[in-house]
């Protein structure tokens, strides 16, 4: 077990803070909830603190919760491939570009680390080149979320990881908005981190609303499990 992994044996409170600017539309989001890495479970509620969110909530899911991949459940035989927990408590910087097909792109930079007993994800997001009446600024996405696989590989040069995946957002007309994600994570501290073999995270997310919440918000329930690396030969012959 890495030292960082010991911090995730129980339920951990999570705080998410985002400052965004998409095509000049500025906004802030605050999120709170908890994670339980034993089950790969996240429960979070996000509120736009600046009024109405200028982009659809589903386009921010990867920035919020796929940002705290340290809550992914890594099975026992894969624990040596869990970069995310091994970087804690000092944490990691997570940088992404999200390319939306036939539309603009988001660039994000986040610091994910422990502040006291709370896992904090502080994010800056900049979006450019979006069409004012496109699927994103035109709010044409359905309020739901598909399952995805998130592919992880070691980046030995930067002592971190690279992560690629393609998100499929459902559009109200029945079509799909594709969003290609390119991510890199580098540790904040200078302690040792686990550099993984290639594998993936399997994610399932459910979006809902709080009937008592008047502000623009999103409630998120998510389960994330690491997969893609088989047991070693010694395990097979036990």
């Amino acid at each position: 077990m890495s030292k960082g992994e010991e911090l995730f044996t129980g339920v951990v409170p999570i705080l998410v803070e985002l400052d965004g600017d998409v095509n000049g539309h500025k906004f802030s989001v605050s999120g709170e909830g908890e994670g339980d890495a034993t089950y790969g479970k996240l429960t979070l509620k996000f509120i736009c603190t600046t009024g109405k969110l200028p982009v659809p909530w589903p386009t921010l899911v990867t920035t919020f919760s796929y940002g705290v991949q340290c809550f992914s459940r890594y099975p026992d035989h894969m624990k040596q491939h869990d970069f995310f927990k091994s970087a804690m408590p000092e944490g990691y910087v997570q940088e992404r570009t999200i390319f939306f097909k036939d539309d603009g792109n988001y660039k994000t930079r986040a610091e994910v680390k422990f502040e006291g007993d709370t896992l904090v994800n502080r994010i800056e997001l900049k979006g450019i080149d979006f069409k004012e009446d496109g699927n994103i600024l035109g709010h044409k996405l359905e309020y739901n979320y598909n399952s995805h696989n998130v592919y992880i590989m070691a980046d030995k040069q930067k002592n971190g990881i690279k992560v690629n995946f393609k998100i499929r957002h459902n559009i109200e007309d029945g079509s799909v908005q594709l969003a290609d994600h390119y991510q890199q994570n580098t540790p904040i501290g200078d302690g040792p981190v686990l550099l993984p073999d290639n594998h993936y995270l399997s994610t399932q997310s459910a979006l809902s609303k709080d009937p008592n919440e008047k502000r623009d918000h999103m409630v998120l329930l998510e389960f994330v499990t690491a997969a893609g690396i088989t047991h070693g030969m010694d395990e097979l012959y036990k």
């Epitope: 570009t97 603009g104 792109n105 660039k107 290609d180 390119y182 890199q184």
Partner: nanobody
Framework: ESGGGSVQAGGSLKLSCAAS???????MGWFRQAPGKEREGVAS????????YYTDSVKGRFTISQDNAKNTIYLQMNSLKPEDTARYYC????????????????WGQGTQVTVSS
Amino acid sequence: ESGGGSVQAGGSLKLSCAASGYISSNCMGWFRQAPGKEREGVASIYRGYGNTYYTDSVKGRFTISQDNAKNTIYLQMNSLKPEDTARYYCAAVNCARWPFDREYNYWGQGTQVTVSS
């Protein structure tokens, strides 16, 4: 890289870059270096969907494009100015830190562009 040359102000040139497997990436960019100056990013393209980015000084004048079948990136330069004089390079870009963070510590020979007034 190829396609450079000498041209009068207001003229046009089209640069091309055949990206070999070694330096190829899903994101590619054009960079330039004028004598005595730092190398700077000019334009970048995401090859998956064709998303593009331009530095302010070339917006509306330069166009980056691609031919996926030929694994080639182009830079169409119109309304050239003397301040565009530089050696131009194409390079693989780190998509996560798009538009101008290089993927590899490697530069090609580049192609010289000279714009006279």
